[in-house]
Structure formats: structure tokens, C-alpha cells
């Protein structure tokens, strides 16, 4: 099962990865 560290809740919807400053990494909990 894949979960996220953090949340997209506070991220503004950006038009791509070029403007992203912080990455929510995938965490493999399997």
C-alpha cells in the first residue's frame, strides 16, 4: 500500500513540476 508523507491539502494546483518547491514523497508501507 502506498501512502504519502504530508498531504496535498496545502499545495496550490500547479501546472507541472517545474514550479514545485517541496516534494511529498511516496512511502511504501507494504
Amino acid at each position: 500500500v502506498k501512502s504519502k508523507i504530508g498531504s496535498t491539502e496545502n499545495l496550490k494546483h500547479q501546472p507541472g513540476g517545474g514550479k514545485v518547491q517541496i516534494i511529498n514523497k511516496k512511502l511504501d508501507l507494504s
Epitope: 496535498t8 499545495l11 507541472g16 513540476g17 517545474g18 514545485v20 518547491q21 511529498n24 511516496k26
Partner: antibody
Framework: QVQLVQSGAEVKKPGSSVKVSCKAS????????ISWVRQAPGQGLEWMGE????????YYNEKFKGRVTITADKSTSTAYMELSSLRSEDTAVYYC?????????????WGQGTLVTVSS | DIVMSQSPLSLPVTPGEPASISCKSS????????????LAWYLQKPGQSPQLLIY???TRESGVPDRFTGSGSGTDFTLKISRVEAEDVGVYYC????????FGQGTKVEIK
Amino acid sequence: QVQLVQSGAEVKKPGSSVKVSCKASGYTFSDYVISWVRQAPGQGLEWMGEIFPRSGSTYYNEKFKGRVTITADKSTSTAYMELSSLRSEDTAVYYCARDYYGTSFAMDYWGQGTLVTVSS
Amino acid sequence: DIVMSQSPLSLPVTPGEPASISCKSSQSLLNSRTRKNYLAWYLQKPGQSPQLLIYWASTRESGVPDRFTGSGSGTDFTLKISRVEAEDVGVYYCKQSFYLRTFGQGTKVEIK
């Protein structure tokens, strides 16, 4: 498990509109972007646009601006793509895909595709 | 708009042999803040929806065999299959998500 289930095939007349649905399950619908991608017969993949259901914010491919509208209903976890002023060149398989917005920005799950045929 | 160009467009392969596909973008896909290249690879098998193979240019998606390797940075990227298997046939697409989304034209991999 994550699933994206699309509506069935459509046959449309030139000049009319089509609305394709994409019902998501197995994850939190609001946390991911839904992208729409089409594929004309024997051709490659073409990104049409996307929506972030949490806010309703959208981005579109300039090629389709003014003709395509992407919406989402959080209460039913369903995204919609409506394409208007249809012409024969719009005959294609239309896919929705879950886009891992905020991290990889990659489409990790895809719907089964919806064939839209535009013919007089 | 960011333009993606793939080569070759057709790639006949022999099972057990390596294969390589090139993808070039019209501008850099590297975000200097995140140090990630926003480049993904997809495989569309005959009659199926596309499936994600690689994201961030070199990170394999869960469940993707390790014979698939993505590399490159900036504007030049490569997908390598160390030993092609019969199930690998289909059309491979690169896609940028640095700004909006653009797919390459696709590379059709078929068994010789």
C-alpha cells in the same frame, strides 16, 4: 484497489458535444489530479487537460481551449470531460488518468478508455 | 509549449537482446529546487490502456521489472531494456510534466 471506470462508447454527429465520465474508487479523490488524454486511431497520446478536484482548478491544452471543459463531482468521485463542436478528427479513444500531483506528476492509474466516434 | 521528440519511431528487437529509446525535450525538465526531472515513460501494450513505467526520469514504478532503466537529465533522456521479453512489445511514450503535459510521438517496439 484504485480503479478508474469510464462511461461507454458514443457515436456523435459533427457539431454536437460529448461528455465522458470517469468514476474513481480506492483512493481519496480530492488528493490527486485527473488528467484526460486522447488517442486517435493509429496515433499517439495527446494530453487534453486536467482538474484538481479539491479546488476545481483546471489546466487545458491550448489546442482544445474553448472546446473542452473538465469538471469533477467530489460527492460521487467522478470527473467529466466535455468536448464541443465535434468534428471527424475528434474520433478517438479518450482516457482519464490519475495524476500524482505534487510529487511525480505521473499518471499511475488509467481508465479503460472511451471510444468516441464522430460521423454524419 | 514543450516539444518532446522520440527516436527511433520503430524498433524491431530480438528477445534476450537489449533495446534503447531516446527522448529529447525542447527545454530542460529539471527543477533545480527539487532536483527532479519531470519526465515519465509509459508503455501501451496492444489493445490496452497505457501503463506507467518510470517517473522522475529514473524511478521505476512499483511492480515494473528491473530490466527497465530510465536515465538522463535536462533535455536528453533514455529508456533501456536490458533483455527484451515478448511481453515488452507495444508503444513506448515519454512524457514531460515540467509545464503542463506533452507526450512524445511514441516508439513501436516489435519482435523481429
